[in-house]
Each structure stands twice: as C-alpha cells, then as structure tokens.
C-alpha cells in the first residue's frame, strides 16, 4: 500500500513526462518567510558578498533579486532593525560599468535609489529604509530567495 | 474535478504540515542529468568561477560539490570531451590557506588529486581525467547541481 506522497511522486513524474513541469516549491521550507511568490531566508550571521552568494547557492537558492520598487518596499518591511544591512544579488560589473544582477540582467535605474558609489568591488545591500553600495568585502547579513510557485515548462539555459 | 497534480499539491502540503518536509525534487528538470541522488547541469557556455557560481545560484542550484573519489569518477564519466574543463564549487581560501567547498567545509586531501598550485585566486576545475587548479578568472564551463531526493526535516542554518 503506497502512501499518498509516494502515489503523488508517481503522479507528478507521469505528468511531467507530458508537460516537462518541475514540481517546484509548493510552500516555504521551515525558517523561510513567504513574500508573495517567493520564499526568503534572512541570515543571522555575517559574510562578505561572495560568501553570501555561495551560501545561498548551497541552499539551492539565489541571493535576493528585486524586480521593482514595490518588491523592495515589501522586503524592507520584513527588516526589523533600522541599521542592519543585508546583501542582495546585485553588484558592480567593471567591464560593463553598470550594476548587474546575478542573473545577468542590468539594473533598471528607476528601480532602486542607490546611496554610494558605483565602482569596482561594490555590491548592493538593503536596510529597512535604503539601498546602499558597500565594498563587497564588508561582512554583513544577506537574503536568499527561492521561487515559490511551480512553473510549467521552466527550463534553464545558460546565462 | 481536481487533476491528480492539484490533488497532489494538497496531499504534499498536508503531509508537510506534519513532517516539515520540503517537497524537494522528485526527478530532474529538463536538460539536467541524473547522477545518483543529484541532478547535474553541464554548461555549454564559459564563465569565470564567480559568474559560474552566480549562474548556478540563479538556477536555485549549487556549483558541483563532490563528496568522494567515487562521485568524482562517476561525474567525469559524463564528460564527453577530453580537453574540456568545468568549474566545481571548490576554491582556495587565502585566510584559511586551504581548499574550501562553497558550503564552508574544507577539502579532505585524499578526495581529489589536484594538479596545480594552492594559492590566492585559485579555483578548481575538473576534466574527463583530472582535477586542476586554475586562476578563478579563467573562462571555462561549469557544472551546477541540485539534490534530487526530498529530505525530511531539512533545515537551512547559516553557513
């Protein structure tokens, strides 16, 4: 007698053969907070930007990617302390002389009002109220994200 | 009338409430290759190590972590071309003067026989036959991984 979960696994695999659907994340893992269609994990320890990126990656997640001002505000509302900074997935690309998200896209200049310099070894952090350019070597907290909803026919081409 | 997938979603969510289980990946997404309990994605484009790490992260995956010599050999068996190099999730930590996996653990010196220097700005690549230390700025292919099996009570403490 199979459990409902085991039967589910068979059902989903059979369905996927027809639709190439990834099961995706149905709800947020323990300790992660849901914000709309994402799960967010706010770290409690500190790291430079690179190590923060690596940490999210090993959790099979991404440093936070912010789509627009609205998502920024909703994320900032989850930050309790005024002075705490969190790394997000945005840093300065020296070769392209522009702010670049870790998914390869460039920052739309209207999305975030960044305080600080756009220069080599600069990475972006957010606080409860602002968005700051900091040296990537600065050791602060960070935010990882996972997409919550299953996406049909989601594929992964190289960036 | 709910589809079997919709019923499954309910079943899994109800089950998770009891077990704090993440649905996890039931099988590999399209274009990913299964290797035991992992899904691997071999890139077709090239990037420096940092960008490779970022790419895996935005795919909600990790640069490849290799547990032991056996896993290395099985991974190398999937590489078709003798001359192609792929980044994995291992680089040199200058502060700790040691090879460090991106999950924070150190390399067990018996696991991989690395050809090349252990020094600043060195990252590890694998080929069909060997393991090499390369400058992290070198633009080569890379391998992302996702854990395949759902893990009960899997939590994500900070690294």
């Amino acid at each position: 007698q199979k459990s409902s979960i085991e039967k589910c696994s068979v059902d989903i695999q059979q369905s996927r053969n027809k639709t190439t659907e990834r099961p995706g994340l149905l709800n947020c893992p323990i300790y992660w907070q849901q914000l709309r269609e994402k799960c967010l994990l706010f770290s409690h320890t500190v790291n430079p930007w690179n190590n923060s990126l690596a940490d999210c990656s090993t959790k099979e997640s991404s440093l936070l990617l912010i789509r627009d001002k609205d998502e920024l505000i909703h994320t900032q509302n989850l930050i309790r302390d005024k002075a705490i900074l969190f790394w997000i997935g945005l840093n300065f690309s020296l070769s392209e002389k522009n702010w670049k998200w870790i998914n390869g896209s460039f920052l739309n200049s209207n999305d975030l009002e960044i305080r600080g310099d756009a220069k080599e070894n600069s990475c972006i952090s957010i606080s409860q109220t602002s968005v700051y350019s900091e040296y990537c070597s600065t050791e602060i907290r960070w935010i990882c994200q996972k997409e919550l909803t299953p996406v049909r026919n989601k594929v992964y081409p190289d960036s | 009338q709910k589809s079997s997938i919709e019923k499954c979603s309910v079943d899994i969510q109800q089950s998770r409430n009891k077990t704090t289980e993440r649905p996890g990946l039931l099988n590999c997404p399209i274009y990913w290759q299964q290797l035991r309990e992992k899904c691997l994605l071999f890139s077709h484009t090239v990037n420096p190590w940092n960008n490779s790490l970022a790419d895996c992260s935005t795919k909600e995956s990790s640069l490849l972590l290799i547990r032991d010599k056996d896993e290395l050999i099985h991974t190398q068996n999937l590489i078709r071309d003798k001359a192609i190099l792929f980044w994995i999730g291992l680089n040199f930590s200058l502060s700790e003067k040691n090879w460090k996996w991106i999950n924070g653990s150190f390399l067990n010196s018996n696991d991989l026989e690395i050809r090349g220097d252990a020094k600043e700005n060195s990252c590890i690549s694998i080929s069909q036959t060997s393991v090499y230390s390369e400058y992290c700025s070198t633009e080569i292919r890379w391998i992302c991984q996702k854990e395949l099996t759902p893990v009960r009570n899997k939590v994500y403490p900070d690294s």
């Epitope: 705490i84 602002s130 900091e134 | -």
Partner: antibody
Amino acid sequence: QVQLVESGGGLVKPGGSLRLSCAASGFTFSQYYMSWIRQAPGKGLEWVSYISPSGATIYYADSVKGRFTISRDNAKNSLYLQMNSLRAEDTAVYYCARSLMATGTHLYFDLWGRGTLVTVSS
Amino acid sequence: DIQLTQSPSSVSASVGDRVTITCRASQGISSWLAWYQQKPGKAPKLLIYAASALQSGVPSRFSGSGSGTDFTLTISSLQPEDFATYYCQQVTSAPPYTFGGGTKVEIK
C-alpha cells in the same frame, strides 16, 4: 554576561612597545566588527582601528598607521592591539568596542570595555 | 576626513528642562550618525544610532533627528542621571570614524 575586558596597559618609555588584549564573553564574538578607541586625559574620543569579523579587513587611523597592529583570535574570543614606537601623544585610556552587528563597516559601538590606561613617558 | 562640530560645548540646565545638542558634519553623511553619553571615569554608552534609532534599554526621553549634515540630540525632560558629556560620531563606511568634540551637560 555580555562584556569586554581590556588588559595590558601600563607605563612605557617613548619608543617602547605594549600589547593590549580584550577578552569578550557572553556573545558570538566571531560575528562582530571590533575596534579600539582611545581617549587622552581630559580630551574627546578618537577611533584607532577596526577589524572585520573574519579578520580579512583592517583599518587604522592615520595617527597610528605603521606603528599599531590590530588582530583577533575568534577561537579565544579575544581582540589585540600591538603598539610599537610609542609616543607621548599615545597616552590615553584605550577602549575595546563592539560594533552593532550586521551594520558592516558602519561602526556604531554598542558595547564598550572599561578601558585600560597607557602612559607613555620618560 | 569628515569633521563633526558639536554645539554648544557645554550647557547648564535644570532637572525637567528640555535640552537640545546639535552636531554638524563637514559633508553629507546620510543618516550614518550615532550619539553617546559618557560619565566621568566610565566608558561611553550608545544612545542613538542611524541618526534616530533608540538603542535598546535607553529611556524614551532621548531622541535623535536629522540627516545629511545637520543632526540633533534632544533630552525631553532632563533627569539627574543625564548630567554627562555627549558625543556624536559619524559612521560612513569609509574610515576614519570621527567623533564630535563633546557637549558637557552640567547642573544649573
């Protein structure tokens, strides 16, 4: 109990050396930026140096650059300040201070030790 | 380097008075400013950070305001234990982290 305790101060001749220590307890020392701040008798506060949680990033005030060395041992929950080529103007109470966590290099000092007096005189 | 100028350098006040201390930065520092209280023979104590955030355990009669170059520390109703020297400090991400010259609050 959350506290910082400095030690190692004393009387030293100009050109001499001293090593200050700061023992931390009651918090996760390895997660905080730590600093040394000094106060000359009857004067204001002067930031001297900071070290990041991992020890990878260090900065000094121009007045001590090349003479003082900050270091930390996270396994021992300890912060150090090696002071060489001491001058009369280095005479001060030296405080060890913790920065508010996760504000990075924006160093708000939320926990201070009681200080240790360094006197440089011939 | 960023200079901080505090005024007044000293103020005489009575218990129950409202006391205001100002701190002016030589260039804009956003909200990266802190206020400390120091009593004779003691270490300084953090009162306000991020220009206006009250540090845990600090009485609500202390408040901070301002951004850019001009900042204010206000004690709404002076208590006997508030007689001390107050320092502002700028904490922009680039050292050095300078302090103001201090304001001594004395009993009238």
